[in-house]
């Protein structure tokens, strides 16, 4: 599943490098997934959210982002995820890379990377 | 019925090590549902969450900063139960410490709890 | 680490009363909060979670409210037994912390 998963994820950054016209020199943060989830490219001072994984949810390769990204005049709307709720993990793109996550998976979620190996 | 019971010394001198355990009934230090925590209260400090030790496939230990550099929380799988061990006490250490299960229900809580032990550091 | 206070430190009330305690933590924590309750010489006792869900067994004249910074504590018709101390913690991120605590004593 977690294979799966990660294979996913990188055809989803694939689609979104295309549409956000990112390459390898790009300034900002590549899109990843972390062993839990998939996080988004973005461009540096975005803050990026996910909902916490359903962790054994077999992914549609056509779905849209399940993330939502918060930029200088982005403030998503009333569907967007938001940090006040709860399930939910922030990274913020610095100039330094992807920041760690907030809360921690364990806090926000209720698992950490330890059991998606399993 | 989960319950926790605490046992080990009320009295350390400074720069030993204080050593707690908590027997686990009702439930399996091994859960993979569950963390094992402890916690101290004193009048200076109040509550103050040490840490927890958890099994996921392996074990894993979350510390607080404040004691990381001396704290250790080990599980014991064979009698179903979990230590703690401060090392290098001093006075300031002196707390009632209880151990406490955490649960998952959209947070981490502590459900239940030992019946608390006073420690004392002291000469 | 996220500091959490609460007010009152502590009040006095009668049987029958409706209080409220407020927890306040120095950031947003969501609805990461928990809240429990502590008699003389006893271990705390688990109330309330996530903000606002109550614990199996707890009376329901017991709620929780608040999301973010600003938390409550509701006691609906203070019983004897609800004479005690109250303490928030939030659950966000570690180290968990503990608000200082509540007492609630007989007017």
């Known amino acids: 599943i977690f294979k799966k998963e990660q294979a996913m994820c990188l055809e989803k950054i694939q689609r979104a490098n295309e549409l956000m016209g990112f390459n390898d020199s790009s300034p900002g943060c590549p899109g990843m997934w972390d062993n839990i989830t998939c996080w988004k490219p973005a461009h540096v001072g975005e803050m990026v959210l996910v909902s916490c994984p359903e962790l054994f949810r077999i992914f549609n390769p056509d779905q849209v982002w399940e993330t939502e990204t918060i930029g200088e005049s982005d403030f998503g709307d009333s569907n967007s995820l938001d940090l006040s709720d709860m399930g939910v993990v922030s990274r913020n793109c610095t100039e330094d890379g992807w920041s760690e996550p907030f809360p921690h998976y364990f806090d926000a979620c209720g698992f950490d990377e330890y059991e998606s190996e399993t | 019925q989960v319950q926790l019971q605490q046992s080990g010394p009320g009295l350390v001198k400074p720069s030993q090590t204080l050593s707690l355990t908590c027997a686990i009934s009702?439930?399996?230090?091994?859960?993979?549902?569950?963390?094992w925590n402890w916690i101290r209260q004193s009048p200076s400090r109040g509550l103050e969450w040490l840490g927890r030790?958890?099994?996921?496939?392996?074990?894993?230990?979350h510390y607080a900063v404040s004691v990381k550099s001396r704290i250790t929380i080990n599980p014991d799988t064979s009698k179903s139960q979990f230590s703690l061990q401060l090392n290098s006490v001093t006075p300031e250490d002196t707390a009632v410490y209880y151990c406490?299960?955490?649960?998952?229900?959209?947070?981490?809580?502590?459900?239940?709890w030992g019946q608390g032990t006073l420690v004392t550091v002291s000469s | 680490d996220i500091q959490m206070t609460q007010s009152p430190s502590s009040l006095s009330a009668s049987v029958g009363d409706r209080i409220t305690i407020t927890c306040r933590a120095s950031?947003?924590?969501?609805?990461?909060l928990s809240w429990y309750q502590q008699k003389p010489g006893k271990a705390p006792k688990l109330l309330i979670f996530?903000?606002?869900r109550l614990q199996s067994g707890i009376p329901s004249r017991f709620s929780g409210s608040g999301s973010g910074t600003d938390f409550t504590l509701t006691i609906n018709s203070l019983q004897p037994e609800d004479f005690a101390t109250y303490f928030c913690?939030?659950?966000?991120?570690?180290?968990?912390?503990f608000g200082p605590g509540t007492k609630v004593d007989i007017k």
């Open positions: 913690q939030q659950a966000i991120s570690i180290p968990y912390t």
């Open positions: 030790t958890y099994y996921r496939g392996q074990w894993k230990n």
């Open positions: 009702g439930d399996s230090v091994s859960s993979r549902y569950a963390t």
């Open positions: 950031q947003p924590i969501s609805r990461y």
């Open positions: 406490a299960r955490g649960m998952w229900n959209q947070n981490w809580f502590l459900d239940h």
């Open positions: 996530a903000g606002q």
